[in-house]
Amino acid sequence: SIPWNLERITPPRYRADEYQPPDGGSLVEVYLLDTSIQSDHREIEGRVMVTDFENVPEEDGTRFHRQASKCDSHGTHLAGVVSGRDAGVAKGASMRSLRVLNCQGKGTVSGTLIGLEFIRKSQLVQPVGPLVVLLPLAGGYSRVLNAACQRLARAGVVLVTAAGNFRDDACLYSPASAPEVITVGATNAQDQPVTLGTLGTNFGRCVDLFAPGEDIIGASSDCSTCFVSQSGTSQAAAHVAGIAAMMLSAEPELTLAELRQRLIHFSAKDVINEAWFPEDQRVLTPNLVAALPPSTHGAGWQLFCRTVWSAHSGPTRMATAIARCAPDEELLSCSSFSRSGKRRGERMEAQGGKLVCRAHNAFGGEGVYAIARCCLLPQANCSVHTAPPAEASMGTRVHCHQQGHVLTGCSSHWEVEDLGTHKPPVLRPRGQPNQCVGHREASIHASCCHAPGLECKVKEHGIPAPQEQVTVACEEGWTLTGCSALPGTSHVLGAYAVDNTCVVRSRDVSTTGSTSEEAVTAVAICCRSRHLAQASQELQ
Amino acid sequence: EAPEHGTTATFHRCAKDPWRLPGTYVVVLKEETHLSQSERTARRLQAQAARRGYLTKILHVFHGLLPGFLVKMSGDLLELALKLPHVDYIEEDSSVFAQ
């Protein structure tokens, strides 16, 4: 029988034993930074090369007894999850192990840094195919460890790490908090976040996705043919490292940004019970469980987008929050969210030659989040067009006036503390899809992009009576690039994209005493690329 | 040579106290620093520390990913180390754990 975790990551309509070929991931090398491992275990023999790298602290305690099987336990299991012959995800992937954790599973930031440097030097001396680095470890937030991960990622290496087992915000830990790293939380057979004793999987905006991480069967270092069940975000990260190896083996030219977008795209959506997470983290935590793509062929024709949340701005009057896309992603839209509803909107602005999404807190607000919609759009040329507050009853409007440019997102930003709520909602005049409309006291920013074959359309869903949540989704074949609310009045908490759905949140009606005239409309901009679709068809 | 005007090197340490490893520090140098400069900066720290009666040990010189070095020294020397040329920031070593 197939272990539940391998079944779970196999796409529907496939059997896991058919789907996971013995050579899956064979073009990829996976580096494992962990404990020592039993590399001659039947599950992994010939698949794992133990490097001579070792940088570990002394074990704690005077009476510590160094028992080989205990020393090897964590690393052996993870190597088995990645590439084990019976219970591995990428059965053909070859692995290299570096020892950075001692027999108690403890290491240092400096030892991990030296390990990452060792990998970079090995890559320079003997360039091979795609590299995946698995970091099944966590420490407190570390600027230097995050910086090293960033450098290695920019050298073309895919880094996958454990979100951490502290039932806490993953952004407080490293390398989980490094934006360039793929950070993985753990779920169980019931798609619940994993509880580990009194703690459990980490969560929050620094988690990219979840993967199976409870009762995972893998190689046991107790004997050369033994198996054992282990749990943790390390096991979850090992699944994603295996899936990444499979994807990179099928498409070796994938960049880190393309790989991350595909991992998100092929994940199971909205299956995790979010009630397990603290209330303030639910909206920030991705509801995604990793899965293998349904085909080993590329999905190059898709327009891939993901949502990136900023850190919380903090409560000061002038506080702002910034959300950034990865270097080879395009920022196609920008929105903001505040739990108190006190915000001054958001704007797209250039920073270091790249667009970022900045959200503004308002006086008395508890803080805001900026939400960037980051997409893979080859040969894109995007710019932001701004209209200052119109002060006219018609409201402010801005459109994409350059030839061949299409509207991908709308943002609005206001200087006044409170946009009037008594004004009637502004409705978009029909037949003008290429423009953003907003409150007359707000500046409106349109994201306008030119890319081969890019086409976009506006989709709206308005509810006459105020609701806590209004949603509008893009249909099959279209990708959500922009999500905003009409009007931008103060009872709107904000707008954000969840997968292909635009969500607009309003304050609880019972506490605001709102009237029915304050209807809220969710405005989605849905795009697709005919160019990518054609290119894909020509390849096949 | 003093650090460039207006750029002050900063010190970082783990927010979780039990995970701190005081006495070992990663000195991170500015992005374009060459290996020879890293080695020179490390030697300079050792020399200045010795003049004050402190023993230091350079455990590793980084290059390839980040320029810098790993040093075993007293925390009393941090102020001195932060004033060295090319220094971007210094981070106290800390523990990481299998997850």
């Epitope: 001659d40 039947r42 023999e45 010939g46 133990v50 080989a68 | -």
Partner: antibody, heavy 115, light 107 residues
Framework: QVQLVQSGAEVKKPGASVKVSCKAS????????ISWVRQAPGQGLEWMGW????????NYAQKLQGRGTMTTDPSTSTAYMELRSLRSDDTAVYYC????????WGQGTTVTVSS | DIQMTQSPSSLSASVGDRVTITCRAS??????LDWYQQKPGKAPKLLIY???TRPSGVPSRFSGSGSGTDFTLTISSLQPEDFATYYC?????????FGQGTKVEIK
Amino acid sequence: QVQLVQSGAEVKKPGASVKVSCKASGYALYNYGISWVRQAPGQGLEWMGWVSFYNGNTNYAQKLQGRGTMTTDPSTSTAYMELRSLRSDDTAVYYCARGYVMDIWGQGTTVTVSS
Amino acid sequence: DIQMTQSPSSLSASVGDRVTITCRASQSINNWLDWYQQKPGKAPKLLIYAASTRPSGVPSRFSGSGSGTDFTLTISSLQPEDFATYYCQQDQDIPPTFGQGTKVEIK
């Protein structure tokens, strides 16, 4: 290149012991254990067990339990298979092979048990 | 232990012939089946692992197929150096067990 070189032929009396050696070279020793397989004259192949270079762990076939001992000496990259209380039906060619995958084989050691 | 049964136990063929040897397991072994070639007085040599994967250096005329309990080794065009005994071996469970062998002789 990757190779396993075994010790020479042995002739033993019933009740005696024999120790066959297998020297490995050309690959990362700790990444594979050594399997032992025997083949009686005109017969098929029979797996006897496996031993680890990494930690000395063993995995014996049930038929061998108690009579055989497999060991390794990583310092000389050599694996050993000792068979005690030899009987005439232990007459066979004894092979060592790399790992459980048995992708590389030694040349074989003929052990003859005869009174 | 899993029993492995090979057929035929021997066969005669000519150079250039297509030869097929079958192997049946007493229970499902997924794709964990290896094929070995053994020449007189020599050690066995791995020809196919995991039912269908050829190690580097093995000529492409050798191919393997099957999964579950029924497996086949095919030599597409028999060459003079292919006259030998062929063994299948299951690698699913410990202990690994071998078929009794198929001797391929010159007609």
